[in-house]
């Protein structure tokens, strides 16, 4: 999918409101510097093209994303903001309905997770350097 | 807003133990923050002593280590610091403080401090 | 453990004129997601310390904006650009990569 179109403003909104804080809830106090960020993206489509990969395709070592709340808003998010992307994402649903949810939070998920957190910080902060916004924590 | 109030006893004897707690109001001890304690000995600069996190996990620095406990308390929206075999090295002005996490996991900000208080070891 | 040391220690300033405090870590504060994990808190006469900046140089919520941080690494400097009376205190940067967290020795900022 090319997230050349979406509305980045908007995806930007909903994650400052809910998805940070499903992500922070499910990283459960573990901080985001204990884990080397090894993902990263130039640009607001590239971001969003490396946030959707880590969110929605299993890896060996961590399984399960696909199903946290986080990742439903995500896809909430993406399918809301972005033209067409729902219609992409039909047959991956239908796919992901198939796996069982693993109920453990393993180490490698907390990593995924976090570098998760980096690629959205890369994405508002090329966002707000597009706006000439200066950003508060 | 939120706020957070350290109470215990203002004076302790060289070889006790140091009892404070901190109580927090206009936030859940439950929310993904950590809280800390920091401590100033008198004209003297900050000290991190060490976190909790609502689910019991802790850092604390090694320095202090073998005589530090913290503890929470989540019912009573407290936290509480625990300081062993004092000596008047130990006499500062003690904060509790949190550590809310960022829009992006990040800790490390202590963004709402206690007012301190004193605590004299002497005997 | 991670060493913060400050210069200078002691800082008069004339109300109106810049300000600027230094800090250096004993290694890299600067974390693989490109940002530096190092605050600057003021602790004003009688009060607790209060947060400045965090991540280098991004201002807390509600800090006016004569006071900015820079640095990357190990060498980060706060400066006020126009001192107001109501700046004085001392002054701390922290490191924020790893506990144990430490704070450097503290810059007393007074009015001249």
């Known amino acids: 999918y090319d997230f050349t179109n979406c509305d980045f403003q908007k995806i930007e909104a909903d994650y400052l409101r809910t998805i940070s804080k499903d992500l922070i809830t499910y990283m459960s106090g573990t901080k985001s510097t204990d884990f080397n960020n090894t993902v990263s993206c130039s640009n607001r489509p590239h971001c969003l093209t490396e946030i959707q990969s880590l969110t929605f395709n299993p890896t060996p070592r961590c399984a399960s994303l696909a199903k946290e709340m986080f990742a439903r808003k995500t896809k909430a998010t993406l399918a809301l903001w972005c033209p067409g992307y729902s219609e992409t994402q039909i047959n991956a649903t239908q796919a992901m309905k198939k796996r069982r949810k693993r109920k453990v939070t393993t180490n490698k998920c907390l990593e995924q997770v976090s570098q998760l957190l980096g690629l959205w910080r890369r994405f508002i902060r090329t966002l707000l350097k597009k706006q000439h916004h200066h950003h508060h924590h | 807003q939120v706020q957070l109030q350290e109470s215990g006893p203002g004076l302790v004897k060289p070889s006790g133990t140091l009892s404070l707690t901190c109580a927090v109001s206009?936030?859940?001890?439950?929310?993904?923050?950590?809280w800390s304690w920091v401590r100033q000995p008198p004209g003297k600069g900050l000290e991190w002593i060490g976190e909790?996190?609502?689910?019991?996990?802790?850092n604390y620095n090694p320095s202090l280590k073998s005589r530090v406990t913290l503890s929470v308390d989540t019912s009573k929206n407290q936290f509480s610091l625990r300081l062993s075999s004092v000596t008047a090295a130990d006499t500062a002005v003690y904060y509790c403080?949190?550590?809310?996490?960022?829009?992006?996991?990040?800790?490390?900000?202590?963004?709402?401090w206690g007012q301190g208080t004193l605590v004299i070891v002497s005997s | 453990d991670i060493v913060m040391t400050q210069s200078p220690l002691s800082l008069p300033v004339t109300p109106g004129e810049p300000a600027s405090i230094s800090c250096r870590s004993s290694?890299?504060?600067?974390?693989?997601?490109?940002?530096?994990?190092l605050d600057w808190y003021l602790q004003k006469p009688g009060q607790s310390p209060q947060l400045l900046i965090c991540?280098?140089?991004d201002r807390a919520s509600g800090v006016p904006d004569r006071f900015s941080g820079s640095g990357s690494g190990t060498d980060f400097t706060l400066k006020i650009s126009r001192v107001e009376a109501e700046d004085v205190g001392v002054y701390y940067c922290?490191?924020?990569?790893?506990?144990?967290?430490?704070f450097g020795q503290g810059t007393k900022l007074e009015i001249k």
């Open positions: 290694q890299s504060l600067l974390h693989s997601n490109g940002y530096n994990y």
């Open positions: 922290m490191q924020a990569l790893q506990t144990p967290y430490t």
């Open positions: 991540l280098g140089s």
């Open positions: 909790i996190y609502h689910s019991g996990r802790t």
């Open positions: 206009g936030d859940s001890i439950s929310n993904y923050n950590w």
């Open positions: 403080a949190r550590d809310a996490p960022s829009d992006y996991g990040d800790y490390g900000f202590f963004d709402h």
